[in-house]
Amino acid sequence: GILNLNKMVKQVTGKMPILSYWPYGCHCGLGGRGQPKDATDWCCQTHDCCYDHLKTQGCSIYKDYYRYNFSQGNIHCSDKGSWCEQQLCACDKEVAFCLKRNLDTYQKRLRFYWRPHCRGQTPGC
């Protein structure tokens, strides 16, 4: 769930998600609309798609709590628990490392970006 995601993003990126990513651009944080503003925003849009897919599979994406290990900068999603828990971990791991890969293009001006300015076509999943 959300607690897992926050912890994982902090471990991988070194940034506090609540201060750096939720919200950011047009897709990081709750909801999402329009064209992603940059590579970091694209990470979140892809993550939204990942969650949307799990929702169609009946997974409780905000409630399910999964186990994972973080060591030497890597995330190992546990094969414990239900299918949904395992897949949720995979979605969160992907976004965490995507955000890390794009730290060099992170733009402070996109933090708390005003969502009405998010125009254009929302990318399909």
């Epitope: 009946g58 399910d64 094969d79 414990k80 299918w83 949904c84």
Partner: antibody, heavy 121, light 106 residues
Framework: QVTLKESGPGILQSSQTLSLTCSFS??????????VSWIRQPSGKGLEWLAH???????RYNPSLKSRLTISKNTSRNQVFLKITDVDTADSATYYC?????????????WGQGTLVTVSA | QIVLTQSPAIMSASPGEKVTISCSAS?????MYWYQQKPGSSPKPWIY???NLASGVPARFSGSGSGTSYSLTISSMEAEDAATYYC?????????FGAGTKLELK
């Protein structure tokens, strides 16, 4: 060869605590990825999953019974335990311990013979 | 929790007859697992991840399905197939079983 065997009190009174032991051989609960579940089956009825314990002592419980269940293990003695508090006649059942398959960790490939527990009012 | 509804609850089949046992999930699941149980014995693993036969299961058995609808099929009923069959999911917690389908020999 993997084997599991359950043992229990046989008969106990309502409101007592049920203590079950699963003794196994052919694998070790210190092996990464390994785990054991408890599953019960009232006479003539279906199966109900109760709890699971992993090699690293991570535990999972059926939410409908969580407040009454405690699963634990003794890795060196190859045993897994289940305690059910405040039992009722509805807890009368055959209790199985089971181990998932390595090739499919959501399939219980190995089962004990079961131990019959009767709760009298 | 996901509720698995098996149908029929009881059925009988003649030797050589094709048999289909259904398992319907209250919400979509990724895989279904099946067990065979005979009176006085523990359940045996029968089918895993929807369509894979467990070790020692005769090839006349097959499994299929997706979403909320799954089934176990016996292409040609044999006397030794008389048993109760249970479906199981662990798509989401908690792990749940169906109530079982008792298959009798006609």
């Amino acid at each position: 060869q993997v084997t599991l065997k359950e043992s229990g009190p046989g008969i106990l009174q309502s409101s007592q605590t049920l203590s079950l032991t699963c003794s196994f051989s052919g694998f070790s609960l210190s092996t990464s990825g390994m785990g054991v579940s408890w599953i019960r089956q009232p006479s003539g009825k279906g199966l109900e999953w109760l709890a699971h314990i992993y090699w690293d002592d991570d535990k999972r419980y059926n939410p409908s019974l969580k407040s009454r269940l405690t699963i634990s293990k003794n890795t060196s003695r190859n045993q897994v335990f289940l305690k059910i508090t405040d039992v009722d006649t509805a807890d009368s059942a055959t209790y199985y311990c089971a181990r998932p398959a390595f090739y499919s960790n959501h399939l219980f490939a190995y089962w004990g013979q079961g131990t019959l527990v009767t709760v009298s009012a | 929790q996901i509720v698995l509804t098996q149908s029929p609850a009881i059925m009988s089949a003649s030797p050589g007859e094709k048999v289909t046992i259904s398992c319907s999930a209250s919400s979509s699941v990724s895989y279904m697992y099946w067990y065979q149980q005979k009176p006085g014995s523990s359940p045996k693993p029968w089918i895993y991840r929807t369509s894979n036969l467990a070790s020692g299961v005769p090839a006349r058995f097959s499994g299929s399905g997706s979403g909320t609808s799954y089934s176990l099929t016996i292409s040609s009923m044999e006397a030794e197939d008389a048993a109760t069959y249970y479906c199981q999911q662990y798509h989401s917690s908690p792990l749940t079983f169906g109530a079982g389908t008792k298959l009798e020999l006609k």
